[in-house]
């Protein structure tokens, strides 16, 4: 089917368009182009007649059109009036007509836009500003850019008039930015030059610098005032209410005690008509005063609070020094000095931060020291400890237990036996105990300042007979040649002897075996697989003796270098290959095979039926122990010969 494609469809004025013909018939008498959607002789543009072999212009020919051999029509120097439909009329050799219509649209090349504003100097928090993108152009889209970004979403920004107008309500100083507008149509896009919005604001409350308010007699006083303001503020200084001068800086050389007083800076914005003032009190000392330390927290809590120690007074051009425990400050990430060294901050205080702290002011000749300050760091209570550590007592003796928990302020203690409150003392004394005094002894420590409590429970057994002991271990699965194991004989009992047996024998002499803690603890250093034995501990006193159940040490080891069996390496074709791999290991290792580097199966036995010379190669067994994290392997070469080629070959399994 004959069709027309316009390239481009949207054409800019002054540019060109090609009406491209698709599926032009083969045998032609001629073809002709017309303006509009139908064939109309009065609107013929140009035609080509095969008979004359000439192109003939028609009434609608403007001199800007070119017809091509493929019947396509080029229109140059496009004008607005060219918009619309174009019809190609094709007459075939058999005089049958065909028609096709195409169209394009013409748009102007947009001019560079500009921004007009209804208010060149809006006042912050008071005025609105309306920007309008000029000129108004038909069929154009308007866009806005702020600092080369698309418009932010804000209830104070409003687009209107087909997006041609951008209104900023209640302008703020943050609206001081570069504004651009852009016009777009299907053939062009143009951006305006930027317009900088000049928002009048302020003055804000002025700041007087430097911040220090204490000076020494004879120094120069140099105060500077600044207030955020547009246009820049005009400044005035007053001392004790009396006007001094209209400058941003106030300079008084060689000050005396008489210069002490209130210093006021007034900032004025002539455009907004607003005034703001700030007052600072200046103290001039005749002599440098003895420094003293102020703290922002007199009772800081450990691991919770920070403490800021400040050296007073603040004096200009002064060097501040600090000492802790009569030493210069240690390097610590928890110690921070301010820029002027006047403030020492202890981040997340600990009980070790109590001090004493001293600060100093350096004069020309000497250093003036403050009195020392000690921090009262509240901490604890830590877990209380009950002493002595014995848990077994004989009837008839006195039971004297003492409780202690690190705490500031000191902890208050309470004792409970089997959950029943006994007394509010640090020590618990029971004379001439009997079996009935056996039970759970709880010490509770309480810190009244922090409100925290901590408890420790101890089981006391009163018995003439020693109990059956048990063995506790610090490592249930030690790794060979790496770990140590400490066995402890429980319980701890008064006036008791502790003994040890290994595999029913008394302890062998070995540098790897060590007794400690009154023989209660047996330590094996650098365990080996040979240490995997039965360990028994015994306790005895003048009345009785008892032994624990044996504890067998489970030593993790291996895998050792594996062994592949049978050892044969030569096989006859047709035999079965049945290789078994074994490695000493605890726990048992995982096995895997590789033939010529290619992974096979994860089994201990590798079986291949009816092998051929194709099965020649290297057979590797890999072992891994997940518990020790260790691996090992071995490689075996297998040769398979054709049947009957060589004597002495294994027939296989």
């Amino acid at each position: 089917k004959l069709t027309i494609e316009s390239t481009p469809f949207n054409v800019a004025e002054g540019k060109e368009v090609l009406l491209l013909v698709h599926n032009l018939p083969q045998h032609l008498f001629g073809y002709s182009w017309y303006k509009g959607e139908r064939v109309d002789g009065n609107r013929q543009i140009i035609g080509y007649v095969i008979g004359t072999q000439q192109a003939t212009p028609g009434p609608a020919y403007s001199g800007r059109e070119i017809i091509y051999p493929n019947a396509s029509l080029l229109i140059q120097n496009i004008i607005q009036n060219d918009t619309g439909f174009y019809t190609l009329h094709v007459i075939k050799s058999d005089l049958v007509n065909e028609e096709a219509t195409g169209q394009f649209r013409v748009y102007p090349e947009l001019p560079k836009p500009s921004i007009s504003s209804n208010n060149s100097k809006p006042v912050e928090d008071k005025d609105a500003v309306a920007f309008t993108c000029e000129p108004e152009t038909q069929d154009a889209t308007y866009l806005w850019w702020v600092n080369n970004q698309s418009l932010p979403v804000s209830p104070r920004l409003q687009l209107s008039n087909g997006n041609r107008t951008l209104t900023l309500f209640n302008v703020t100083r943050n609206d001081t930015a570069s504004y651009k507008c852009e016009t777009q149509n299907p053939v062009s896009a143009r951006r305006s030059d930027s317009v900088i919005l000049n928002v009048l604001y302020g003055p804000d409350a002025p700041t007087i610098s430097p911040l220090n308010t204490s000076y020494r007699s004879g120094e120069n006083l140099n105060l500077s005032c600044h207030a955020a303001s547009n246009p820049p503020a005009q400044y005035s200084w007053f001392v004790n209410g009396t006007f001094q001068q209209s400058t941003q800086e106030l300079f008084i050389p060689n000050i005396t005690v008489n210069n002490s007083g209130s210093y006021t800076c007034q900032a004025h914005n002539s455009d907004t008509g607003l005034n703001r003032t700030t007052v600072t009190t200046i103290t001039v000392y005749a002599e440098p005063p003895k420094p003293f330390i102020t703290s922002n927290n007199s009772n800081p809590v450990e691991d919770e609070d920070a403490v800021a120690l400040t050296c007073e007074p603040e004096i200009q051009n002064t060097t501040y020094l600090w000492w802790v425990n009569n030493q210069s400050l240690p390097v610590s990430p928890r110690l921070q000095l301010s820029n002027d060294n006047r403030t020492l901050t202890l981040l997340s205080v600990t009980r070790n931060d109590v001090g004493p702290y001293e600060c100093g002011i350096q004069n020309e000749l000497s250093v003036d020291h403050s009195d020392p300050v000690i921090l009262n760091v509240l901490y604890g209570p830590d877990d209380p400890t009950i002493s002595p550590s014995y848990t077994y007592y004989r009837p008839g003796v006195n039971l004297s237990l003492s409780c202690h928990a690190a705490s500031n302020p000191p902890a208050q203690y309470s004792w409970l036996i089997d959950g029943n409150i006994q007394q509010h003392t640090q020590e618990l004394f029971i004379s001439n105990i009997t079996e009935k005094n056996s039970g759970l002894y709880t010490c509770q420590a309480n810190n009244s300042a922090s409100g925290h409590s901590r408890t420790t429970v101890k089981t006391i057994t009163v018995s003439a007979e020693l109990p059956k002991p048990s063995i506790s271990s610090n490592n249930s699965k030690p790794v060979e040649d790496k770990d140590a194991v400490a066995f402890t004989c429980e319980p701890e009992a008064q006036n008791t002897t502790y003994l040890w047996w290994v595999n029913g024998q008394s302890l062998p002499v070995s540098p790897r075996l060590q007794l400690s803690n009154g023989n209660r603890t047996l330590t094996l250093f650098n365990v080996t697989r040979n240490d995997a034995r039965a360990y028994v501990c015994g306790i005895q006193n003048s009345v009785s003796a008892n032994r624990s159940d044996p504890v067998t040490l489970d030593v993790l080891y291996g895998p050792d270098t594996p062994i592949i069996s049978p050892p044969d390496s030569s096989y006859l074709s047709g035999a079965n290959l049945n290789l078994s791999c074994h490695s000493a290991s605890n726990p048992s290792p995982q096995y895997s095979w590789r033939i010529n580097g290619i992974p096979q199966q994860h089994t201990q036995v590798l079986f291949i039926a009816k092998i051929t010379p194709n099965n020649n190669g290297t057979y590797a067994c890999f072992v891994s122990n997940l518990a020790t994290g260790r691996n090992n392997s071995i490689v075996k070469s297998i040769t398979v010969s054709a049947s009957g080629t060589s004597p002495g070959l294994s027939a296989g399994a």
Epitope: Q26, H27, L28, Y48, I50, G51, T52, Q53, Q54, A55, G63, I66, I67, Y68, P69
Partner: antibody
Amino acid sequence: QIQLVQSGPELKKPGETVKISCKASGYTFTNYGMNWVNQAPGKGLKWMGWINTNTGEPTYAEEFKGRFAFSLETSASTAYLQINNLKNEDTATYFCARLWYLYFDVWGAGTTVTVSS
Amino acid sequence: DIQMTQSPASQSASLGESVTITCLASQTIGTRLAWYQQKPGKSPQLLIYAATRLADGVPSRFSGSGSGTKFSFKISSLQAEDFVSYYCQQLYSTPYTFGGGTKLEIK
């Protein structure tokens, strides 16, 4: 592809006749006129005329009326230029060129005719 | 007949330079003007048609301008292969006359 293939060079004596061929391929021969252009050695191009390949009607430039004749063999997509009663001044290269109303877009390689006694 | 006056007949220029050739028609021909390049021993090749339009495959350093009776042809930044002959031709009416040609020579 579209091409015009011309016959080979000719060496003739004065008074003889020469007929040059121009065979078209790659397009519909009868849709485009065929031009003939002459170029004497070291000289510029001269338009001799054209033949309407659809009707067979020739048009000659004034200078080439009389001894020069354009003809067609439409079935063979071939145009011919015949020069009768050759003169020494007919020594030139003769080009055929396909006509589109705005340009000559396809040219033959040229046939050199040398007239010498 | 429409006469086409092409100038200059020859011009010397250096590689990288620009050259302009002009063609004057003895009567108005609209924009029905073509420019051709001819290399020694070869047939002419179409460069520009309709006074300003570049033929397919022709480098953009070639350009044409003008309408009515005065036409220009420009080559910007001459390459070595551009030092050959150039012809204008009117196709407004028969006879389709050529200009006398311009031979570009390397300086």
